[in-house]
């Protein structure tokens, strides 16, 4: 299924919920997240939530990150093709990406950018 056309949602509420969800995922990791799938280590500072969504959309059928995908889908108000950032050349495990996204989200929430 191609990338969805997105309607943006209320950022402050969704951002708070994203942080809660990412925190839950990092705390609840009893087994390997998404069967240790690898994702592109995108530059979140440049591409933001749209870049994060684009990277995580390539993870298939992982219920553990389903809600994260939904929240990112709401936070990103661009089509996937509109995301302008340099193409990544490194892949990391989903768990590592989730931690990276959590830190980025906390910074955004803290400094209100």
């Amino acid at each position: 299924t191609p990338g969805p056309v997105r309607r943006s949602t209320s950022p402050p509420v969704a951002l708070r919920e994203l942080i809660e969800e990412l925190s839950n995922i990092t705390q609840d990791q009893k087994t390997s997240l998404c069967n240790s799938s690898m994702v592109w280590s995108v530059d979140l500072t440049a591409g933001g939530f749209c870049a994060a969504l684009e990277s995580l959309t390539n993870i298939s059928s992982c219920n553990a990150i389903h809600r994260t995908q939904r929240i990112l889908n709401g936070l990103c108000n661009q089509k996937a093709s509109d995301v302008a950032s340099s193409p990544p050349d490194t892949k990391i495990e989903v768990a590592q990406f989730i931690s990276k996204l959590l830190n980025y989200s906390k910074q955004l929430f803290r400094y209100g950018h």
Partner: antibody
């Protein structure tokens, strides 16, 4: 390209257990969700159960006590069992897959007609 | 469970005319600004085929005479100019909440 194929008995007797298999090719079941849906002759689709790539299972609330879904990743097969079959369970049973967000069912098998009769 | 109610049960439309199918959910299927509502087409003797996902996004290869709209609990599938090959039963389906549920279907015929 992902393809799904259902297999199982065409005829089962009342009170027996139905076992259906969905064989998936073109995708690994560790990263692919499989759903079971049924359709009685001339009637609407009814969603039965699903198993996510990472193992989470969801069942139809009304049929939950009769259904079991499982998968064999090495064979790339998903198995649905339905206990205590009744003539009203006569239907075409489909397996359908959804790999990526937003998880709409974009790949369907051709279906397997199961008749429940003594 | 979310109950999906489709109307009408059947629809008879002349070739080239507009066909409109409605689907109402018993509770909102919206999540974070998106509607987790999908539409399927089932032609006689065939399995269903995904037409529209997330309420309004056309699946690859689907003709643009098909369109979807709506949010919350009320959704519409429109065929702008009915063609002979559009004769089928159309189903709405939600996956905002588990378990997934389908509508009862709308049969589209040619008048």
């Amino acid at each position: 390209q992902v393809t799904l194929r259902e297999s199982g008995p065409a005829l089962v007797k009342p009170t027996q257990t139905l076992t259906l298999t969905c064989t998936v090719s073109g995708a690994s079941l560790s990263a692919y969700s499989v759903n079971w849906i049924r359709q009685p002759p001339g009637k609407a689709l009814e969603w039965l159960a699903m198993i996510w790539g990472d193992g989470k299972i969801v069942y139809n609330s009304a049929l939950k006590s009769r259904l079991t879904i499982s998968k064999d990743t090495s064979k790339n097969q998903v198995v649905l069992t339905m206990t205590n079959m009744d003539p009203v369970d006569t239907a075409t049973y489909y397996c359908a897959g959804d790999g990526y967000f937003p998880y709409a069912m974009d790949n369907w098998g051709q279906g397997s007609l199961v008749t429940v009769s003594s | 469970d979310i109950v999906m109610t489709q109307s009408p049960d059947s629809l008879s439309v002349s070739l080239g005319e507009r066909a409109t199918i409605n689907c109402r959910a018993s509770k909102s299927v919206d999540s974070y600004g998106n509607s987790y509502m999908h539409w399927y087409q089932q032609k006689p003797g065939q399995p269903p085929k995904l037409l529209i996902y997330l309420a309004s996004n056309l699946e690859s290869g689907v003709p643009d005479r098909f369109s979807g709209s709506g949010s919350g609990t009320d959704f519409t599938l429109t065929i702008s100019s009915l063609q002979a090959e559009d004769v089928a039963v159309y189903y709405c389906q939600q996956n905002n909440e588990d378990p997934r549920t389908f509508g009862g279907g709308t049969k589209v015929e040619i008048k």
